[in-house]
């Protein structure tokens, strides 16, 4: 669809005469009729296939035509067409004299024609005007013309429809050739596809408008490149959505079980050494001078009862001090001024002279101790139980009540599931958090390496001369079934050539 535009510029009829040569009275009141039709080698009368247009009276005799509307008419004249412009045309321009106000053809006398011009040729669509001038014996007409496309039509033939839009069906303007030019932020054949935020993950992100990045299920982050872990995942991460891969030191399906209580909680006090011993379980090894499950209790230096012979111990900032009873002296009241004559031994202890009677020693009955048998034996004072075990006095002896996971007289042994050698056939045993695991040697499998996995002894093709090989599952060895004419454990000897045995 387009418009053929004709711009009349000047008409000269100096003598004011009609085509017949007769003069107009009082002058030639001139109007024009235009006929546009398909190309004809010789322009002939007939239908104006591309359209017609008439002007009002534009002037008398000779005159210039203004570029705008004149007396209700328009200049340039518009001849619209609703088809593909063929590129060629024929044009007839007639100048007529209007004696009255009725310009219809049937109202005019036949000799009212002033002049008639006919042209034909090629004309491409374009903005530029073609200037032309046609002269007859009595008149001259100067005009220009062009073909332009109607709104929303583009291309060499005005055949390409393109209407700019910015809605759900597209976001574009039209180029001069009718191709779409997407508005910023849009792409695709019809500019319907938004350009997402730069860096938005191609698979995991999408957008409904430009510079947006909406995440698909299971993904998060500004660019939808971070997976969402499984709901409930505590100390874990993911590489694809809804996973939960535990961080170091955490276990359980939701990584909520602390396998490294020592590092995460630092329960041991006063410089003690912490050892993990299972889920939420640990053992503190105390430095000298401290005790308690977490080594939180400071041992008094008097707790070890360093004062002998009934001396009383006093804690001091830099140690302790023994107050000795009468008859004793020394740092620990270890020296006696008494002899056996003074009956220094208590609780039935027997006295023995030493250094020619200058000193003595008490031999104590069971359950009593001390230089003078003055102390009842408390076998738990030295904290003999390791790994947080509880010491119990049992008459003349003592025993340790161990925490779970420990054993031995003093709870010094970690319970090992591997101690009973559960892995068969030379399997290697590994202690795990709540059990054990066997690593089996070649040829064995199962939780305890108890299943013999047959080793294919025939895999190395040990039989010769097309013999058939069989694996003996009981010994993991092979047996060769020889074809006729061969003997030997590998069927390597032809019959008739006895093997040369070395014995």
């Amino acid at each position: 669809s387009g418009v053929f535009q004709l711009q009349l510029q000047e008409f000269i009829n100096e003598r004011g005469v009609l085509a017949s040569g007769r003069p107009c009275e009082p002058g030639c009141r001139t109007f024009f009729r235009v006929c546009l039709k398909h190309f004809q080698a010789v322009v002939s009368p007939g239908p104006c296939t591309f359209g017609t247009v008439s002007t009002p009276v534009l002037g008398t005799n000779s005159f210039a035509v203004r570029d705008d509307s004149s007396g209700g008419g328009r200049n340039p004249l518009q001849l619209p067409f609703n088809f593909t412009w063929p590129g060629t045309f024929s044009l007839i321009i007639e100048a007529w004299h209007a004696p009255g106000d009725d310009l219809r053809p049937e109202a005019l006398p036949p000799d009212a024609l002033i002049s008639k011009i006919a042209i034909q040729g090629s004309l491409a669509v374009g903005q530029n005007w073609l200037l032309d001038e046609q002269t007859s014996t009595l008149t001259r007409l100067r005009y220009s013309y062009r073909v332009i496309c109607s709104d929303n039509y583009y291309g060499d033939n005005c055949s390409r429809l393109c209407k700019k839009r910015n809605d759900h069906f597209g976001h574009y303007v039209c180029q001069p050739d009718g191709n779409l030019s997407c508005l910023p932020g849009w792409t695709g054949e019809y500019c319907q596809q938004p350009i997402c935020l730069s860096g938005c993950h191609e698979q995991n992100g999408y957008c409904s408008k430009p510079a947006e990045c909406l995440c698909r299920p299971g993904w998060q982050g500004r660019l939808c490149n971070e997976c969402i872990p499984h709901n409930g995942c505590r100390h874990g991460t993911c590489s694809t959505p809804w996973q939960c891969t535990c961080d170091e030191g955490w276990g359980g399906l939701f990584c909520d079980q602390d396998l490294n209580y020592c590092t995460h909680h630092s329960p041991c006090k006063n410089g003690a050494t912490c050892s993990n011993s299972g889920q939420r379980s640990y053992t503190c090894t105390c430095r000298p001078g401290y005790t308690g499950v977490d080594c939180e209790l400071e041992l008094s230096e008097c707790d070890s009862n360093p004062c002998r012979n009934g001396g009383s111990c006093k804690d001091q900032e830099d140690g302790y001090h023994c107050l000795c009873p009468p008859g004793y002296y020394g740092l620990h009241c270890e020296h006696s001024t008494l002899s056996c004559a003074d009956s220094p031994c208590f609780n039935g202890g027997s006295c023995r002279e030493r250094n020619q009677g200058a000193n003595y020693a008490c031999e104590c009955p069971p359950n009593f101790t001390g230089s003078n048998c003055e102390k009842k034996v408390d076998r738990c004072t030295s904290n003999p139980c390791a790994n947080g075990g509880q010491c119990l006095n049992r008459g003349p002896s003592r025993m340790c009540r161990c925490r779970p996971g420990f054993t031995g007289t003093y709870c010094e042994l970690h319970v090992s599931d591997c101690a009973r050698n559960p892995c068969a056939h030379g399997g290697t045993c590994h202690d795990l958090e709540n059990g054990l695991m066997c690593t089996c040697p070649a040829g064995f499998s199962g939780r305890r390496c108890e299943v013999r996995t047959s080793i294919d002894a025939c895999a190395s093709s040990p039989c010769f001369n097309r013999a058939t090989c069989y694996t003996d599952l009981s010994t993991d060895t092979f047996v060769c079934n020889c074809p006729y004419g061969f003997v030997g454990s590998r069927c390597e000897f032809p019959v008739g050539l006895p093997p040369s045995f070395p014995w």
Epitope: Q243, C244, T245, C246, G252, L253, N434, G435
Partner: nanobody, 120 residues
């Protein structure tokens, strides 16, 4: 393709028992630990039990200790959860899951779940 299919759920009275099964395919069953977790409406999921690839290590949440038992039959590629002394608070969708490794550490694949309802 890894697949875990749970079965055995249903309606049971308080104090009753159920045995859930998890049939696995698409991977070497003996290589992976398998566990169970549950999710009640409007609550976070709770890991309740897991068994290592060898079957040597099992663990239970405090809420089910002494009542639930997990076991595996590597020949049948199946893990079982025997649930005894069931309580109304055990009502949930029960899911079978595997971390994709031998130890019970995380979740990589899960099944579609089976509904357990404990009600009188």
């Amino acid at each position: 393709e890894v697949q875990l299919v749970e079965s055995g759920g249903g309606l049971v009275q308080p104090g009753g028992s159920l045995r859930l099964s998890c049939a696995a395919s698409g991977f070497t069953f003996d290589d992976y630990a398998i566990g169970w977790f549950r999710q009640a409406p409007g609550k976070e999921p709770e890991g309740i039990s897991c068994i290592s690839s060898s079957g040597g290590i099992t663990y239970y949440a405090d809420s089910v200790k002494g009542r639930f038992t997990i076991s595996r039959d590597n020949a049948k590629n199946t893990v079982y959860l025997q649930m005894n002394s069931l309580k109304p608070e055990d009502t949930a969708v029960y899911y079978c899951a595997t971390p994709g490794i031998a130890a019970c550490r995380g979740i990589h694949y899960t099944g579609q779940g089976t509904q357990v309802t404990v009600s009188s």
